[in-house]
Amino acid sequence: AAQPNNSLMLQTSKENHALASSSLCMDEKQITQNYSKVLAEVNTSWPVKMATNAVLCCPPIALRNLIIITWEIILRGQPSCTKAYKKETNETKETNCTDERITWVSRPDQNSDLQIRTVAITHDGYYRCIMVTPDGNFHRGYHLQVLVTPEVTLFQNRNRTAVCKAVAGKPAAHISWIPEGDCATKQEYWSNGTVTVKSTCHWEVHNVSTVTCHVSHLTGNKSLYIELLPVPGAKKSAKL
């Protein structure tokens, strides 16, 4: 079965309630021309920031062609939730759906999109739109990865030794130093899926007076610098 290219566009806007909102839909320029009548699974990995709003889209098929629209939601440690709309009877049905933040954007007969209001870590999972037509099913799947921005701190704890921490990020942040030193990195995993990364570096060379900790993360990058003092210096802290 022909499948669309998974090149995507991520649109970000501001909602009235000041939450960033992102909508992931197919980039129209990337759709394969010869679309088969029955589509194999089309899946997309989608990173989305925690506390934003997310909108997930179905394939572009007009309601007049459809029999049933179903959203299947599989979240870690929970039974599969399904939200279905049957066109013939104009009725919606939900099975095992407990999260009130996951809803249809509007009436399914007007808009088949699914929205997640104020994305939380618990929304990590797989979301699939299934459009049932008389001649087969069209699928659009999303592996939703919730991103959590780590809190970054940098401080000196011993003579010519600095500690850079990226606390409670998801996924784990990557820490690098300028200039490079003699470093040890540890990761601490939390039950909610976040990770704290701690990098401790020592510089023996005495002409190194200022060091920079660079934290790379999917939500953005952050650099902090500190002067190496003979005694521990002031603590620096920042959000990405």
């Epitope: 320029k29 098929i61 007009a62 007049r64 062609n65 008389p134 001649d135 069209f138």
Partner: antibody, heavy 119, light 110 residues
Framework: EVQLVESGGGVVQPGGSLRLSCAAS????????MHWVRQAPGKGLEWIGY????????NYNEKFKGRATLSSDKSKNTAYLQMNSLRAEDTAVYYC????????????WGQGTLVTVSS | DIQMTQSPSSLSASVGDRVTITCRAS??????????MHWYQQKPGKAPKLLIY???NLESGVPSRFSGSGSGTDFTLTISSLQPEDFATYYC????????FGQGTKVEIK
């Protein structure tokens, strides 16, 4: 190969009616929405309405409501357009076109049939 | 109903010219990241032929000199280098709700 063939065109008297046929082949007839469009001589395309043979769901351009009726015969794989109270301005080539699912685009059209309303 | 305004209604061009036709909808024809706007070519005595669907996707078998762009209410069909067989009438069409065609643009030989 998908094919749509219209028939039933010809000369009709003002006030009369027409019944056009669109015979479909090369696909499962009940699976796709069929649209009807007309084009007056030297004019643009005008959407009349559609029928979904799967469930006989129909929808019409407001202009043709009450005067046009769409139907289908699943056993014959044929869609029909019936139009009543014909006027000279209904003189046109009438087309049927199949809507594809993805993008709701019209990938297949019939060749058209000419209806002339004249006394 | 959504009204479609196509411009120009006609244009004269030469082989090799770049031709641009625009279509404006009275309200947005985009939803869920897709624009339900299509472009068709029609030659005298023939049925229309699909060129572009969902605003910017080239239908299979259509030459790459044809391209479409736009979203929301404003759309464009571009022929990068006009060929002799491209002299025809072009229509935009939306299929989001009830369907409407633009009034057509006739591309004639200069």
């Amino acid at each position: 190969e998908v094919q749509l063939v219209e028939s039933g065109g010809g000369v009709v008297q003002p006030g009369g009616s027409l019944r056009l046929s669109c015979a479909a082949s090369g696909y499962t007839f009940t699976s796709y929405v069929m649209h009807w469009v007309r084009q007056a001589p030297g004019k643009g395309l005008e959407w009349i309405g559609y029928i979904n043979p799967y469930n006989d769901d129909t929808n019409y351009n407001e202009k043709f409501k009450g005067r046009a009726t769409l139907s289908s015969d699943k056993s014959k794989n044929t869609a029909y357009l019936q139009m009543n109270s014909l006027r000279a301005e209904d003189t046109a080539v009438y087309y049927c076109a199949r809507e594809d699912y993805y993008g709701s685009r019209w990938g297949y059209w019939g060749q058209g049939t000419l209806v002339t309303v004249s006394s | 109903d959504i009204q479609m305004t196509q411009s120009p209604s006609s244009l004269s061009a030469s082989v090799g010219d770049r031709v641009t036709i625009t279509c404006r909808a009275s309200k947005s024809v985009s939803t869920s990241g897709y624009s339900y706007m299509h472009w068709y070519q029609q030659k005298p005595g023939k049925a229309p032929k699909l060129l572009i669907y969902l605003a910017s996707n080239l239908e299979s078998g259509v030459p790459s000199r044809f391209s479409g762009s736009g979203s929301g209410t404003d759309f464009t069909l571009t022929i990068s280098s006009l060929q002799p067989e491209d002299f025809a009438t072009y229509y935009c069409q939306h299929s989001r709700e009830l369907l409407t065609f633009g009034q057509g643009t006739k591309v004639e030989i200069k």
